[in-house]
């Protein structure tokens, strides 16, 4: 058993049929010694008396808010949550496996630049009685500070018969050094509580590996005289790290016909312009990637050819 | 070139070669298949290789103030990785494919380090500890980890030279 926060405790249980469970001793936080009784949740049934209460925790029916009273007055509470371990593996019932980039990916994180700011998100099908708490650090043995905000519901989607809820959180490294080469990964820890079930999820990454620039901005076409060619120009996204002479991007320019089956023409360039042939009903798209480190490409910025 | 007087290197040449290094480091990496470096639960290898840290003066301001600190740091790292790529971790069994980019990568590391430190000028004697002997099954993982770290190292070096070529070239 360990304390998650004040008056909230997590009992770790090996979860299998007829498991013996865990013996837990609760102590009433009071100077009083006599006339103390214990109840669980809203029930008025007295579970025991005295300053301590010993219980055998085996299942969710044994978890909940234990309260000690004296003469009708509440003295203190202890909320017990369960953390299940099945076949040596902690349960992951609350969050959905996103399976990208690999199986057992519950948390996904992205950064728009090297400033030390990043966003993580996760999915669940649970809509109520759900709380999340997020902590983060740079390294684990001698951790350096990362400050995370509160997790918020950022999207709702219908997937077949189910509703899916996306939660996200923004974090900022306290003393970020954008130009340095990271040697210790960022660790992100999410505590999830659904009713009386506790689970924790972790992710470990370098900012450089989760970089995904915003799409290029101000994408424009300039037709070239007496030619089917156009000059495409664009700018670095506002959110990208500066100076651009240091934090450089490379770009992919694509000409795509209306039909998905039509051949795509692609050009790669380090410049912020390119000359391409504009076909009728086609569109021109540009995306960006860090020039020197192969992290994710941005989403496409597009304009029609006409 | 970085010479004892602390004059500028050939920024444009260094930029071109460091960008080539980035390309080679990424094309060399798939040869060991897909593994997650941090899944190994072993920070040792990543801690044992050079890193360009915050105080090394490799940020735009530091380069403007005095690029020599950063260039020396990059030089040390290049020599270090060049020695690793020339060791039996990469030359031993299992043999690399004949067309593996590791050979080119090794040569380019040496080439860039020589651009930074031409004949007759020595920043300091480059010391590297004895390498632990490795078995074939260990080498695959070590190659993977070294190449992953090298990708990050050369990315910072390439940014430095690109910025230098754009803003510090005579």
């Amino acid at each position: 058993i360990w304390e998650l926060k004040k008056d909230v405790y997590v009992v770790e249980l090996d979860w299998y049929p007829d498991a013996p469970g865990e013996m837990v001793v609760l102590t009433c936080d009071t100077p009083e010694e006599d006339g103390i009784t214990w109840t669980l949740d809203q029930s008025s049934e007295v579970l025991g008396s005295g300053k301590t209460l010993t219980i055998q925790v085996k299942e969710f029916g044994d978890a909940g808010q234990y309260t000690c009273h004296k003469g009708g007055e509440v003295l203190s509470h202890s909320l017990l949550l369960l953390h299940k371990k099945e076949d040596g593996i902690w349960s992951t019932d609350i969050l959905k496996d996103q399976k990208e980039p690999k199986n057992k990916t519950f948390l996904r994180c992205e950064a728009k630049n090297y400033s030390g700011r990043f966003t993580c998100w996760w999915l669940t099908t649970i809509s109520t009685d759900l709380t999340f708490s997020v902590k983060s650090s740079r390294g684990s043995s001698d951790p350096q500070g990362v400050t995370c905000g509160a997790a918020t519901l950022s999207a709702e989607r219908v997937r077949g018969d189910n509703k899916e809820y996306e939660y996200s959180v923004e974090c900022q490294e306290d003393s970020a050094c954008p130009a340095a080469e990271e040697s210790l990964p960022i660790e992100v820890m999410v505590d999830a509580v659904h009713k009386l079930k506790y689970e924790n999820y972790t992710s470990s990454f370098f900012i450089r590996d989760i970089i995904k620039p915003d799409p290029p901005k101000n994408l424009q076409l300039k037709p070239l005289k007496n030619s089917r060619q156009v000059e495409v120009s664009w700018e670095y996204p506002d959110t990208w790290s500066t100076p651009h002479s240091y934090f450089s991007l490379t770009f992919c320019v694509q000409v795509q016909g209306k039909s998905k089956r039509e051949k795509k023409d692609r050009v790669f360039t380090d410049k912020t312009s390119a000359t391409v042939i504009c076909r009728k009903n086609a569109s021109i798209s540009v995306r960006a990637q860090d020039r020197y480190y192969s992290s994710s490409w941005s989403e496409w910025a597009s304009v029609p050819c006409s | 070139r970085a010479v004892p007087g602390g004059s500028s290197p050939a920024w444009t040449q260094c930029q071109q070669l460091s960008q080539k290094l980035c390309t080679l480091a990424w094309s060399a990496h798939p040869l060991v298949g897909h593994m997650d470096l941090r899944e190994e639960g072993d920070e040792e290898t990543t801690n044992d290789v050079p890193h360009i840290q915050c105080g090394d003066g490799c940020d735009p301001q530091g380069l403007r103030d005095n690029s020599q600190f950063c260039l020396q740091r990059i030089h040390q790292g290049l020599i270090f990785y060049e020695k690793l790529l020339g060791s039996d971790i990469f030359t031993g069994e299992p043999s690399l494919l004949p067309d593996s980019p590791v050979g080119q990568l090794h040569a380019s590391l040496l080439g860039l380090s020589q651009l930074l430190q031409p004949e007759g000028h020595h920043w300091e004697t480059q010391q590297i500890p004895s390498l632990s002997p490795s078995q074939p099954w260990q080498r695959l993982l070590l190659r993977f980890k070294i190449l992953r770290s090298l990708q990050a190292f050369v990315a910072v070096a390439a940014r430095v030279f690109a910025h230098g070529a754009a803003t510090l070239s005579p």
Partner: antibody, heavy 120, light 113 residues
Framework: QVQLQESGPGLVKPSQTLSLTCTVS????????VHWIRQPPGKGLEWIGV???????DYNSVLKSRVTMSVDTSKNQFSLKVNSVTAADTAVYYC??????????????WGQGTLVTVSS | EIVMTQSPATLSLSPGERATLSCKPS????????????LAWYQQKPGQAPRLLIY???TRQSGIPARFSGSGSGTDFTLTISSLEPEDFAVYYC?????????FGGGTKAEIK
Amino acid sequence: QVQLQESGPGLVKPSQTLSLTCTVSGFSLISYNVHWIRQPPGKGLEWIGVIWTGGSTDYNSVLKSRVTMSVDTSKNQFSLKVNSVTAADTAVYYCARDKYGLFPGYFDYWGQGTLVTVSS
Amino acid sequence: EIVMTQSPATLSLSPGERATLSCKPSQSLLSSGNRKNYLAWYQQKPGQAPRLLIYYASTRQSGIPARFSGSGSGTDFTLTISSLEPEDFAVYYCLQHFNYPWTFGGGTKAEIK
């Protein structure tokens, strides 16, 4: 928890072979090298040799011709043999581990040591 | 082989005093690439195995009190005990693991004055 335990005869006759075993637990043999170090009574520490995670060995050149190290991974046991012993081989013999990495490591855990006396 | 020279051989001090132990290798233990010094410090009490105090010249092993600190680089290293406790009177060894064979210093005995 991590444990290394040396065992073997406390008395060996001159010219015979000293044989010791180091039984380890609490760590993976794939991740750690195991070393033997000795300390003559009242003197300093002397490194004897190492058996690397891959099974290869390196010995101190002073003792190389007389030393053999081996490992039985199924029993988590390492053995040290020193042949043609003399009174100068009388010492406390320790086994210790270091984490396998690119470069040689430091010894973070040691056995409690076993005293071997060479005497007729 | 790298020769490790420790001084003084014996250090006579009273509890509460500051102890400064020196270790000088015959060649540099600094790897300029990764900026690590491949040197460790050990404490040994009578009848016991050595105990790791400091590794990479200045990193304290977990569980070692903050009064123990390591410093230095290259060919000059120091172990400092800021205020000697009675249990600190022991023999201290430095170890180099830059090249094999691994080699130890001859030791410094810290004794009660």
